[in-house]
């Protein structure tokens, strides 16, 4: 009797992972074994598919075959017994196009009202995606296992911290890779569950600020608790794309270390320009905080945004206000790319009540003043961006008094 | 797979120093913290401290601060603890042990061990 | 340094028992803790991390619970491989500290 070539012959590439099915093409022969020949472009000849070769089943691993994985490439397969059955060619493909992307690997760290995820690719070193790898994108879906309502977040990079979530709770989440570049969305990682722990009594720091004082910056934050001791560190913000960098480590402030107060003070060389985030512990010597909500930190911003410099020019019943770049070290001024609002803050030398004026404009009049009497003016500027929503520290406070007034009235 | 390798046990007078080695392999030796924990004879264990091969930080438990010396060679995957001043209550299995990645937020658990190395210190 | 108190320090059992082993540090470590098996001339084996994380291997007859101070570890059923010694250790705060052990002998 003819062998029948088999039929329905199915590719199917995740990560580095190349394996074949197919359908036996007559059920009732037995003992039969099934063999496959592949073919590059361009070459006439075919070569056996090593790992493919007199298997039994109708499933067979050929992963361990060097292939370009950009080049198209052509498969055959045939039955044999005692004879053999004809050959049967597959569709000609790219293993690259066809690749679907595998389910990355997942590590979960829980605070108490945070999860932190680590995600790496499912295949470590992975040939397919050598050219891709720092392209990954990944999306996650999270849900309470309590409740089973699905939240989707997309766009995430390989480290990504969910906050706003309760103690003592359990989360699951699945995670999918993509390749934006290619249109490739992978496959969902398997369910990871874990449970937040109980309610930290020390909470972390809040509202991280940082500012520009003479050659140094300042960095502030906010605590609920007295007597505490703090540390601060930094990483590099590009890094969260890619952890597999060994770059990848969050690293200590040495002038913020162990700090006592709420601010701390470090010279501006301490960073090369770039973008950084920043994130504080507290500690009270025996328990210490989770890590606060990290900031982003842009030299280049926090540079330029020094407190305006400024003149007055003094009438009888206001102020002229002339708003200039403000001075680096070596008097050069500091070239504005953002556009600012400038708040100015003015009070009568004699009393606390301070009087606010907000203004893009770098020319302000202070109106209403009285003639013969001492005011004081300090200035801040502000970013007009959203986004960057950066403040620079008050200018030093001027004073000036006002002329007399106009006796021929 | 994952295996660190310690060098061979050791006798030591009091006061000389003991130089132990544990050679990583099976996954990417500067991704991982390497923490050192000991076991005197019938005892519990205890942590002497860990380092980052990639860059060579380090934080000990302060009781060793003073006598203990992590190292690392990244061109063999080694890490390096020694243990100087040595007196006879440091007789003990030395362990090194694999911690969490450098990139994780927190501490992680101890997954891989090496086999130990025995120190015997006596006169 | 956090204290790690474990209990009992030593527990005889027959094969098929289930067995409880409890560990309570001195201040709360929000589920940093990990148990670990070790057999006499061997290194320490990790079962458990975060407190309740089955590692890759380990026989599901072994489980963890608990938070704050106080921690778990179970032993559905015992098997003859499983009489050693248990260690519980907290990661949260440095030093990394360990409780005394469990020995658990056959009865």
């Known amino acids: 009797k003819n062998l029948k070539s088999p039929q329905k012959v199915e590719v199917d590439i995740i990560d580095d992972n190349f394996i074949l099915r197919w359908n036996r093409s007559d059920e009732s022969v037995g003992n039969v074994t099934f063999s496959f020949d592949y073919q590059k472009t361009g070459m006439d000849n075919w070569i056996k598919l090593s790992g493919c070769q007199n298997i039994t089943s109708t499933k067979c691993n050929f992963s361990s075959l060097k292939l370009n994985v950009y080049e198209e490439i052509k498969l055959r397969i045939r039955a044999e017994k005692e004879n053999t059955s004809s050959w049967y060619e597959v569709d000609s493909f790219t293993p690259f196009r066809k690749a679907q992307i595998g389910p990355p690997e997942v590590h979960l760290e829980a605070e108490d009202k945070a999860i932190v995820i680590h995600i790496s690719p499912g295949t470590k070193d992975s040939v397919m995606w050598a050219l891709d790898g720092l392209s990954f994108t990944y999306s996650l879906v999270i849900w309470k296992n309590s409740s089973g309502v699905e939240e989707r977040i997309e766009n995430i990079y390989s480290r990504h911290k969910i906050y706003k979530l309760s103690p003592e709770t359990t989360y699951c989440l699945k995670v999918k890779a993509a390749l934006l570049t290619s249109w490739k969305i992978g496959v969902y990682s398997p369910v990871h569950c874990i449970k937040t722990t109980v309610e930290n009594e020390l909470p972390p720091p809040e509202n991280i600020e940082v500012s520009v004082q003479n050659q140094n910056y300042v960095l502030k934050w906010d605590y609920t608790y007295a007597n505490m001791t703090f540390q601060v560190q930094w990483l590099h913000a590009f890094l969260k794309r890619n952890p597999g960098n060994h770059l990848y480590k969050w690293k200590q402030i040495p002038d913020c270390e162990n700090v006592k107060t709420t601010q701390c003070v470090f010279p501006q060389n301490v960073f090369q320009k770039g973008i950084y985030l920043l994130r504080v512990q507290a500690s009270d010597g025996n328990n210490t905080s989770f890590w606060s909500e990290e900031i982003k930190f842009d030299t280049e911003i926090q540079a330029f945004l020094l407190p305006p410099v400024f003149n007055i020019r003094s009438l009888s019943d206001s102020f002229h206000i002339y708003i200039g770049a403000p001075k680096q070290s070596g008097n050069t001024p500091v070239i504005q790319d953002y556009p600012l609002i400038y708040e100015i803050i003015f009070w009568e030398n004699t009393s606390n009540a301070e009087r606010k004026i907000i203004e893009k404009k770098t020319d302000v009049t202070v109106p209403n003043l009285k003639p013969l009497t001492v005011y004081c003016v300090k200035a801040r500027a502000h970013t007009m961006d959203e986004k960057l929503n950066k403040s620079s520290v008050f200018s030093d406070a001027v004073c000036e008094k006002t002329k007399p007034g106009n006796t021929s009235k | 797979q994952v295996q660190l390798v310690q060098s061979g046990a050791e006798v030591k007078k009091p006061g000389a120093s003991v130089k132990v080695s544990c050679k990583a392999s099976?996954?990417?030796?500067?991704?991982?913290?390497m923490n050192w924990v000991r076991q005197a004879p019938g005892q519990g264990l205890e942590w002497m401290g860990k380092i980052d091969p990639s860059d060579s930080e380090t934080h000990f438990n302060q009781k060793f601060r003073d006598r203990v010396t992590l190292t690392v060679d990244k061109s063999t995957s080694t890490v390096y603890m020694e243990l100087s001043s040595l007196r006879s209550e440091d007789t003990a299995v030395y362990y090194c042990?694999?911690?969490?990645?450098?990139?994780?937020?927190?501490?992680?658990?101890?997954?891989?061990w090496g086999q130990g190395t025995l120190v015997t210190v006596s006169s | 340094d956090i204290q790690m108190t474990q209990s009992p320090s030593s527990l005889s059992a027959s094969v098929g028992d289930r067995v409880t082993i409890t560990c309570k540090s001195s201040e709360v470590i929000y589920n940093r803790l990990a148990w670990y098996q070790q057999k006499p001339g061997n290194a320490p084996k990790l079962l458990i991390s975060?407190?309740?994380t089955l590692e890759s291997g380990v026989p599901s007859r072994f489980s963890g619970s608990g938070s704050g101070k106080d921690y778990t570890l179970t032993i559905s059923s015992l098997q003859p491989e499983d009489f050693a010694t248990y260690y519980c250790q907290q990661y949260w705060n440095k030093p990394f500290t360990f409780g005394q052990g469990t020995k658990l002998e056959i009865k």
């Open positions: 099976g996954y990417t030796f500067t991704s991982y913290w």
């Open positions: 975060g407190a309740t």
């Open positions: 042990a694999r911690g969490g990645r450098i990139s994780f937020d927190y501490d992680a658990a101890l997954d891989y």
